[in-house]
């Protein structure tokens, strides 16, 4: 889904039945700690020397919804995610480095604590390098482990 084609997606009013209180997780892992903004996430990543995982998604995108469910229910991914600074965004940032090959969703981009976008950590689709589908959880898990091997260890 290309967010330049359709943005400002709204939640179905019928979907606003009582649920758990809305958190920054937006359903990607309620037990995890999520940052609110990209700027905060970069600061936390640099100061804690932990990589940042940025998930771009839209409420009204079927592939975002589908990936969110498998991500949230995948125990190993959820456990490994504790070692990251986490951010999920339903809007695009002004940092073009977070969309190396376009503003599609869902896409997952990793950022090193040195504030280098890990453009080398890609999914399996040549036309959308940072896209993941529900069948790609094993690859995503491997890529998360790859991102944890930092580019430069700070002394």
């Amino acid at each position: 889904k290309d967010t330049t084609v359709k943005s400002g997606a709204k939640k179905d009013p019928k979907d606003s039945r009582p649920k758990l209180p809305q958190t920054l997780s937006r359903g990607w892992g309620d037990q995890l700690i999520w940052t609110q903004t990209y700027e905060e996430a970069l600061y936390r990543s640099k100061t804690s020397n932990r990589p940042l995982m940025v998930i771009h998604h839209l409420d009204e995108c079927p592939h975002s919804q589908a990936l969110k469910k498998v991500f949230a229910e995948h125990k190993e991914i959820q456990k490994l995610a504790e070692q990251f600074v986490l951010l999920n965004l339903v809007y695009e940032t002004t940092d073009k480095h977070l969309s190396p090959d376009g503003q599609y969703v869902p896409r997952i981009v990793f950022v090193d604590p040195s504030l280098t976008v890990r453009a080398d950590i890609t999914g399996r689709y040549s036309n959308r390098l940072y896209a993941y589908e529900p069948s790609d959880t094993a690859l995503l898990y491997d890529n998360m482990k790859k991102a944890l091997k930092l580019l430069k260890t700070e002394l």
Epitope: K1, Q65, K69
Partner: antibody
Framework: QVQLVQSGSELKKPGASVKVSCKTS????????MNWVRQAPGQGLEWIGW????????NYNGKFKDRFVLSADKSVSTVYLQISSLKAEDTAVYFC?????????????WGQGTLVTVSS | DIQMTQSPSSLSASVGDRVTITCKAS??????LSWFQQKPGKAPKTLIY???RLVDGVPSRFSGSGSGQDFTLTISSLQPEDIATYYC?????????FGGGTKVEIK
């Protein structure tokens, strides 16, 4: 093996409600999206909406937002489509269709269909 | 909503013929397209997903191709049991939308 078994045909009067069920077996019920599709007599297919049985999240085709409600009961691995204030134009076969085995959105397995006839 | 234009609406071919059905989306849908076969009075059966992936158990004479806006379902050698109506479906964006269908008959 995966099975989706739908409830039997219904004859209803205009203004009444109907609840169609789709009982599933052979896979992890809570982890696959369930779609509902309708087909009016002699017509093509129309997507009504989907539900994620794990947490009840739904999304509806705007055309069906007002009178159509999707729900799921994990205890009996069954999803439901309820239509209220029935109209003659709701006369159709209603199908449930499971999403991909891995949680993907594509429609993989289909129920046999339930004919709902609305007539006075 | 994304419009799916399927053509032809009907076709007649001989057993053994190569049959091609096309589906055109009103906007780019990546490869998020499925093909279904429906016989009279029966539920649809999924043949292809993600434009070109064959569902387990579907005969290899069925194949799908395309991405972006233009997609094709090909039956390499038409068999009598292939008489049915075929539908495409885009699942890139809500609401999912079907093509109008192609009725395949034997000459």
């Amino acid at each position: 093996q995966v099975q989706l078994v739908q409830s039997g045909s219904e004859l209803k009067k205009p203004g009444a409600s109907v609840k169609v069920s789709c009982k599933t077996s052979g896979y992890v019920f809570s982890r696959s999206w369930m779609n509902w599709v309708r087909q009016a007599p002699g017509q093509g297919l129309e997507w009504i909406g989907w539900i994620y049985p794990g947490d009840g999240d739904t999304n509806y085709n705007g055309k069906f937002k007002d009178r159509f409600v999707l729900s799921a009961d994990k205890s009996v691995s069954t999803v439901y489509l309820q239509i209220s204030s029935l109209k003659a134009e709701d006369t159709a076969v209603y199908f449930c269709a499971r999403g991909g085995y891995d949680g993907s959105p594509w429609l993989s397995y289909w129920g046999q269909g339930t004919l709902v006839t609305v007539s006075s | 909503d994304i419009q799916m234009t399927q053509s032809p609406s009907s076709l007649s071919a001989s057993v053994g013929d190569r049959v091609t059905i096309t589906c055109k989306a009103s906007q780019d849908i990546n490869s998020y397209l499925s093909w279904f076969q429906q016989k009279p009075g029966k539920a649809p059966k999924t043949l292809i997903y993600r434009a070109n992936r064959l569902v387990d158990g579907v005969p290899s004479r069925f194949s799908g191709s395309g991405s972006g806006q233009d997609f094709t379902l090909t039956i390499s050698s038409l068999q009598p049991e292939d008489i049915a109506t075929y539908y495409c479906l885009q699942y890139d964006e809500f609401p999912f939308t079907f093509g109008g269908g192609t009725k395949v008959e034997i000459k």
